[in-house]
């Protein structure tokens, strides 16, 4: 099979790290500096990715694999293969077109990326709020009043914060 395939297409024998060179009668040529081919049978080598600016090099390029980038501190990767770097925000914030903004009341974000999400609605599950939510943390739902049998110690709800749903600053 290999012999048949190579007779049909000599390029199929060119391994990773090489390309099938039309300028050399289709013999396999090693990839030139700062280029790579990660699979066999390639007709060109791809230029190595350069991690510049807000990107930093996580893995150097080689003749058989591309460089891999991540983001400098204060930024995080977005997209396949870290194609973009997005600014980090603090917990309790989300990134908008105007920069990092605090989560609106009733929403939270416990990460440095992503959007603010609504607090869990405990009553939808027939439960009560055990711990109030904050900008950084979701509410903690407790057992429903019906779950507490007579005589069982009930959980005293926390004192309300000055701004409902937020911890005192």
């Amino acid at each position: 099979f290999e012999r048949t395939r190579s007779l049909q297409d000599p390029c199929s024998n060119c391994p990773a790290g090489t390309f099938c060179d039309n300028n050399r009668n289709q013999i396999c040529s090693p990839c030139p500096p700062n280029s790579f081919s990660s699979a066999g049978g390639q007709r060109t080598c791809d230029i190595c990715r350069q991690c510049k600016g807000v990107f930093r090099t996580r893995k150097e390029c080689s003749s058989t694999s591309n460089a891999e980038c991540d983001c400098t501190p204060g930024f995080h990767c977005l997209g396949a293969g870290c194609s973009m770097c997005e600014q980090d925000c603090k917990q309790g914030q989300e990134l908008t077109k105007k920069g990092c903004k605090d989560c609106c009341f009733g929403t939270f974000n416990d990460q440095k990326r992503g959007i603010c999400r609504p607090w869990t609605n405990c009553s939808l599950d027939g439960k009560s709020v055990l711990v109030n939510g904050t900008k950084e943390r979701d509410v903690v739902c407790g057992p429903s009043p019906a779950d507490l049998s007579p005589g069982a110690s009930s959980v005293t709800p926390p004192a309300p914060a000055r701004e409902p749903g937020h911890s005192p600053q």
Partner: nanobody
Framework: AVQLVESGGGSVQPGGSLRLSCAAS????????SAWYRQAPGKQRELVAW???????HYADSAKGRFTISRDNTNKTAYLQMNSLNVEDTAVYYC?????WGQGTQVTVSS
């Protein structure tokens, strides 16, 4: 002019060894890949072993486990140590660096 000059070819019996050398003039070894090719009569020239630009050695399937490529940048010389030679290894062996080719050295394996 930049030149590559091979040496070390010859006749050897099956199972024998040879060490090919490729001496370069000029400054190409610090820039380009070093590679060894071979061409048997009536066949296309094929890549046998090469040191890539990232200084990693690579081998064609036919050379793996038997051939070793190395390079001495100080002496501007590349080497191909060939062990366990068999009749199919008979060919003219060429040194290559970038666009520069050596004149070739004959390797003949026969009993």
């Amino acid at each position: 002019a930049v030149q590559l000059v091979e040496s070390g070819g010859g006749s050897v019996q099956p199972g024998g060894s040879l060490r090919l050398s490729c001496a370069a003039s000029g400054n190409i070894f610090n820039i380009h890949v070093s590679a060894w090719y071979r061409q048997a009569p009536g066949k296309q020239r094929e890549l046998v072993a090469w040191i890539a630009w990232d200084n990693v050695a690579h081998y064609a399937d036919s050379a793996k486990g038997r051939f070793t490529i190395s390079r001495d940048n100080t002496n501007k010389t590349a080497y191909l140590q060939m062990n366990s030679l068999n009749v199919e290894d008979t060919a003219v062996y060429y040194c290559n660096s970038g666009d520069i080719w050596g004149q070739g050295t004959q390797v003949t394996v026969s009993s």
